[in-house]
């Protein structure tokens, strides 16, 4: 398989996962393309401890994670339930707002300057961050 | 020297399938998204299909999807491509490609010398 | 889908400055790359990332990248250039080659 027991050359590793921090900006659906192509997602927010991790790494930019509702209700792409999970949005937000003028609402969710969420056109290059799990199996104990 | 070199070319009547593969040396295999692209004769390069490193994310062209397969085996450094309900227009060169960094970013910096399908009755 | 439009052929003479362009919607927020075919070969990356050569290229070979057309110059033009060069660039999950330019030393 394509299990990994520790991270890749530029990758950090955090709470058994490693994460790559872009420094370049993509739309979400590429982005989205680049983390998979790494065998990796779009990084998945699942707590407040991991929200602090990756906002002392991103810093006060704009930074697509793995979270979208292109098609109907908000998904994270790992499957990850939206509903029951962790959310970090900003008051008022995700507002699918269509003032922009670019066509179509918000879709994709991003980390603020502040670190909360937005939603966001998907189409703005934003930077991004890619995660993958290492692998669970060599988290259990050896047999005696 | 790093190298690729594919097999598993052939006659192939239409409907059927075949299954290429590429062996890959030289360097760190898993390492590297690859994919396979063709040239029918006399014309220009289309892409098939990627595979990242790890194997667990494939892309095709619209024309294969649905017909063909790509895969790797990292333990055997070997790239693979299963087709399936071949069509004439399926007949041309095919050639195994290696990817310099993330095929988002990056172009295809080896090349293997290629090996022809030809689907015919 | 998206496409990557090139000029079927170019002629230059030796020693002179060849200049391919690809032209794509917004190919400049893309990466381009470039690739060079002789007859009955396969194809070698001559540029990627826009503007970036692999080790073993000419420093003849240049390339860049804006709005939406990408641009591979070759100065110097030599007999040894004749060839097909395609441009390509990733989107929306697809790999997508130009036509091919033919270039030709006079």
């Known amino acids: 398989g394509s299990e990994r027991t520790c991270c890749p050359v530029n990758w950090v590793e955090h709470e058994r996962s490693c994460y790559w921090f872009s420094r370049s900006g993509k739309a979400w659906a590429d982005a989205d393309n680049y983390c998979r192509l790494e065998d990796a997602h779009l990084v998945v927010v699942t707590s407040w401890e991991e929200q602090k991790f990756v906002q002392r790494h991103i810093g006060p930019v704009n930074t697509w994670m793995g979270l979208h509702d292109q098609n109907g209700p908000w998904k994270w792409v790992d499957g990850t339930d939206y509903e029951t999970g962790f959310k970090n949005w900003r008051p008022e937000q995700p507002d699918d707002w269509y003032g922009h003028g670019l066509g179509g609402g918000e879709d994709c969710a991003h980390f603020t300057d502040d670190g909360r969420w937005n939603d966001d056109v998907c189409q703005r290059p934003y930077r991004w961050v890619c995660e993958t799990e290492l692998d669970k199996a060599s988290q259990e104990p050896p047999l005696l | 020297e790093v190298q690729l070199l594919e097999s598993g070319g052939g006659l192939v009547q239409p409907g059927g399938s075949l299954r290429l593969s590429c062996a890959a040396s030289?360097?760190?295999?898993?390492?590297?998204?690859m994919s396979w692209v063709r040239q029918a004769p006399g014309k220009g390069l289309e892409w098939v299909s990627v595979?990242?490193?790890?194997?667990?994310?494939?892309y095709y062209a619209d024309s294969v999807k649905g017909r063909f397969t790509i895969s790797r085996d990292n333990s055997k450094n070997t790239l693979y491509l299963q087709m399936n309900s071949l069509r004439a227009e399926d007949t041309a060169v095919y050639y195994c490609?290696?990817?310099?960094?993330?095929?988002?970013?990056?172009?295809?910096?080896?090349w293997g010398q290629g090996t022809t399908v030809t689907v015919s009755s | 889908s998206y496409e990557l439009t090139q000029p079927p052929s170019v002629s230059v003479s030796p020693g002179q400055t060849a200049s391919i362009a690809c032209s794509g919607d917004?190919?400049?927020?893309?990466?381009a790359s470039w690739y060079q075919q002789k007859p009955g070969q396969s194809p070698v990356l001559v540029i990627y990332?826009?503007?970036k050569r692999p080790s073993g290229i000419p420093e003849r070979f240049s390339g860049s990248n804006s709005g939406n057309t990408a641009t591979l110059t070759i100065s110097g033009i030599q007999a040894m250039d004749e060839a097909d060069y395609y441009c390509?660039?990733?989107?929306?999950?697809?790999?997508?080659f130009g036509g091919g330019t033919k270039l030709t030393v006079l």
């Open positions: 917004n190919l400049g927020d893309k990466y």
């Open positions: 390509q660039a990733w989107d929306s999950s697809t790999v997508v």
């Open positions: 030289g360097f760190t295999f898993s390492s590297y998204a």
């Open positions: 990332q826009d503007s």
């Open positions: 595979i990242s490193g790890g194997g667990s994310s494939t």
């Open positions: 490609a290696k990817w310099r960094g993330n095929p988002t970013d990056y172009g295809m910096d080896v």
